[in-house]
């Protein structure tokens, strides 16, 4: 399986909400002995590998933001802790999973990574990740809504997140 990032760049005005999205692609084994661990974290564009370093998102670690379930099941993070920080991660039945960040500030700008760990027979692991950049802007040059740039081409889409 692979992880796709529909958008590689999100440009948002301060105060807006945004939902960053990743999608699980390819054959997903829904067997009894296969589970998926999904999470989010901030990182940096490393010289060797992007998303290698795991930094917190608004003081919440990847441990706080994880989802753990089988196949294409729906799931949400524990609401209380994440929502106090204006965050929520979620997963649907179609392999999409996301993190929503509310009331963006300039400090939220940076590289965000989604991580999927496929666990087979409870201990054999396969890891994949996706990366996307969030730019939070302020002032007269800031867009009125979030503008997202698809990963494949640089045509922008205006969205109200």
């Amino acid at each position: 399986f692979k992880v796709a990032t529909p958008y590689s760049l999100y440009v948002c005005p301060e105060g807006q909400n945004v939902t960053l999205t990743c999608r699980l692609l390819g054959p997903v084994d829904k067997g009894h002995d296969v589970t998926f661990y999904k999470t989010w974290y901030r990182s940096s564009r490393g010289e060797v590998q992007t998303c290698s370093e795991r930094r917190p998102i608004r003081n919440l670690t990847f441990q706080d933001l994880h989802l753990h379930h089988g196949g294409h099941q729906a799931a949400n993070t524990s609401h209380d802790l994440a929502q106090r920080h204006g965050l929520e991660s979620a997963s649907d039945h179609h392999g999409n999973f996301s993190i929503t960040m509310r009331n963006l500030t300039l400090l939220d700008s940076g590289l965000y990574c989604c991580l999927v760990v496929e666990i087979r027979h409870h201990h054999s692991e396969h890891r994949v990740h996706g990366a996307m950049e969030l730019q939070v802007q302020t002032g007269k040059d800031a867009p009125s809504n979030c503008v997202v740039y698809p990963s494949s081409s640089q045509e922008s889409e205006n969205i109200t997140a």
Epitope: Y37, Q63, H68, R127
Partner: antibody
Framework: QVQLVESGGGLVKPGGSLRLSCAAS????????MYWIRQAPGKGLEWVSY????????YYADSVKGRFTISRDNAKNSLYLQMNSLRAEDTAVYYC???????????WGRGTLVTVSS | EIVLTQSPATLSLSPGERATLSCRAS??????LAWYQQKPGQAPRLLIY???NRATGIPARFSASGSGTDFTLTISSLEPEDFAVYYC?????????FGQGTKVEIK
């Protein structure tokens, strides 16, 4: 405070039994895979047993298979290791440690000493 | 199971010197390797994850590199509190295994 605290170690004769406990606090215990890892005096680290976050499945090192039983009670935030038919070579400090998929042992207890001697 | 071999077994150095520790795997572990520090009477502490990333709160004098079968932990300038035993551990294959440790002692 995020911590793991082991208890239940002590001196026991060969063939005897002990039950170790590990109390977790400050984090969502039911999210984590848990391990018992031991360290014989002056030696390195050796994993003993593993239990998934839900309590199943369970794995044991060959050296303890059939003699040790790992279990957990997520409602009590506790991990256990029942050790039977103890041998001199089981003498070690026993640590509990937490783990997540694609991650490492980022939290350990301070350990409890098990001495098997006649 | 994957065997991790650490060298040297003991490293005798003075404070301020550079320490270079090695960990070699019997087969590739990709970048799924961690380093731990253990001081006498204490539990191990995670220093480095995924071969080269410092865990939370670990000083910048600790750095690490490598992938596949050969890995290195470097302490750029030894502080008194760095004298300890260092272990590598892999999670690419089951079971999770540790190296036998390298003791960094005061010369």
């Amino acid at each position: 405070q995020v911590q793991l605290v082991e208890s239940g170690g002590g001196l026991v004769k060969p063939g005897g039994s002990l039950r170790l406990s590990c109390a977790a606090s400050g984090f969502t215990f039911s999210d984590y895979y848990m391990y018992w890892i031991r360290q014989a005096p002056g030696k390195g680290l050796e994993w003993v047993s593993y239990i998934s976050n839900s309590g199943s499945p369970i794995y044991y090192a060959d050296s303890v298979k059939g003699r040790f039983t790992i279990s957990r009670d997520n409602a009590k935030n506790s991990l256990y290791l029942q050790m039977n038919s103890l041998r001199a070579e089981d003498t070690a400090v026993y640590y509990c440690a937490r783990d997540l998929p694609g991650w490492y042992f980022d939290l350990w207890g301070r350990g409890t000493l098990v001495t098997v001697s006649s | 199971e994957i065997v991790l071999t650490q060298s040297p077994a003991t490293l005798s150095l003075s404070p301020g010197e550079r320490a270079t520790l090695s960990c070699r795997a019997s087969q590739s572990v990709s970048s799924y390797l961690a380093w731990y520090q253990q001081k006498p009477g204490q539990a191990p502490r995670l220093l480095i994850y995924d071969a080269s990333n410092r865990a939370t709160g670990i000083p910048a004098r600790f750095s690490a590199s490598g992938s596949g079968t050969d890995f290195t932990l470097t302490i750029s300038s030894l502080e008194p509190e760095d004298f300890a035993v260092y272990y590598c551990q892999q999670r690419n294959n089951w079971p999770r295994t540790f190296g036998q440790g390298t003791k960094v002692e005061i010369k």
